[in-house]
Amino acid sequence: QGNRWRRSKRASYVSNPICKGCLSCSKDNGCSRCQQKLFFFLRREGMRQYGECLHSCPSGYYGHRAPDMNRCARCRIENCDSCFSKDFCTKCKVGFYLHRGRCFDECPDGFAPLEETMECVEGCEVGHWSEWGTCSRNNRTCGFKWGLETRTRQIVKKPAKDTIPCPTIAESRRCKMAMRHCPGGKRTPKAKEKRNKKKKRKLIERAQEQHSVFLATDRANQ
């Protein structure tokens, strides 16, 4: 009597939604064994836990496979929302960037955050800085007290996306000229200008003098 009751009771469980895809199922614990290719998933509801058989694993779980044994295992990667395997994340929690199966609050060096997908993509790769160039001003290396020196670096690898900016590839800084005065009397344009002004002034002065002399002579002749 008791056994027959248990058997009919068990048979009725098959219609229970949690018994879908099960090879063995009970009212209290749900599925204990799944049909081939389905994933066993231990669903937890407060203190209660029961087995289910699923075609694919829910968010936060991945399909853990052993020969003829499939199970939904929890993603254990920090800040990961869904993963492909034990140690490879495919989607991070909000505010974290996905990079090589892991989740970061900021992208590692050499990688740039792509906000629309929240992934770290290869940034713009630049080479090493060159040595500082010669101190110059107006393409001259003498004749001034201060000038600018420049150094550059090459873009080794262009970024994966055009929207990702490259870091600066040239920078300049103020420097002191090696020679303030140019050798061989060569003067700077400013010095030349000063000299020309002086000349001009002298010419005007001389012209004015000559004009004064001319006026005086003219009066005398009258």
């Epitope: 063995s24 599925c31 204990s32 087995g51 003829d68 199970r71």
Partner: antibody, heavy 119, light 107 residues
Framework: EVQLQESGPSLVKPSQTLSLTCSVT????????WSWIRKFPGNKLEFMGY???????YYIPSLKSRVSITRDTSKNQYYLQLNSVTTEDTATYYC?????????????WGQGTLVTVSS | DIKMTQSPSSMYASLGERVTITCKAS??????LSWFQQKPGKSPKTLIY???RLIDGVPSRFSGSGSGQDYSLTINSLEYEDMGIYYC?????????FGAGTRLEIK
């Protein structure tokens, strides 16, 4: 009632092959997972691997190169072969079964057979 | 492989006493833990699976609890027939691994 029974030689010489049989009654080996477990003299238990209902096998990495689990469904028996044995393989060998993640693991065990590796 | 650290390795307890054996996994094993009892000359017997589910026929004085990496087996009121070696087993990940065992003896 599911019953498992191990059988095979109790003494094996070093470098030889250890061969054991597990005879199953009360259940079919075409259902569930059928494994081998051994217990070393210091009481340490080690799971060695299993053969599934479809005949697929899993072996622990440390034994993969020298272990083999096979079956004969007509006899409802499965077998363990461990090659190139050393004295370190001296242990009590058990066959045991389980039916999936949601059920009890190794719910049924054989009584165990002690295998000594010695020249 | 996941390492299961069981403690104590051996213990003496009095009849009627409450006994607790613990198992710590080297990583989160998501409740995939079983407890076994082995008596001298016998094969191991499953007591508990999935952390806290008692096998039919196992006395209710046995109970299991835990989550993440830490699990325990409690015998509420120790009886003479409870002496033996107790093992934990993780089956969260292959290869499944056992604890080293706890030898329980009656004082």
């Amino acid at each position: 009632e599911v019953q498992l029974q191990e059988s095979g030689p109790s003494l094996v010489k070093p470098s030889q092959t250890l061969s054991l049989t597990c005879s199953v009654t009360g259940d079919s080996i075409t259902s569930g997972y059928w494994s081998w477990i051994r217990k070393f003299p210091g009481n340490k238990l080690e799971f060695m691997g299993y053969i599934s209902f479809s005949g697929k096998t899993y072996y622990i990495p440390s034994l993969k190169s020298r272990v083999s689990i096979t079956r004969d469904t007509s006899k409802n028996q499965y077998y363990l072969q461990l090659n190139s044995v050393t004295t370190e393989d001296t242990a009590t060998y058990y066959c045991a079964t389980y039916h999936g993640y949601g059920g009890p693991w190794f719910a049924y065990w054989g009584q165990g057979t002690l295998v000594t590796v010695s020249s | 492989d996941i390492k299961m650290t069981q403690s104590p390795s051996s213990m003496y307890a009095s009849l009627g006493e409450r006994v607790t054996i613990t198992c710590k996994a080297s990583q989160d094993i998501d409740s995939y833990l079983s407890w076994f009892q082995q008596k001298p000359g016998k094969s191991p017997k499953t007591l508990i699976y999935l952390t806290n589910r008692l096998i039919d026929g196992v006395p209710s004085r046995f109970s299991g609890s835990g989550s993440g990496q830490d699990y325990s087996l409690t015998i509420n009121s120790l009886e003479y027939e409870d002496m033996g070696i107790y093992y934990c087993l993780q089956y969260d990940e292959f290869p499944v691994t056992f604890g080293a065992g706890t030898r329980l003896e009656i004082k």
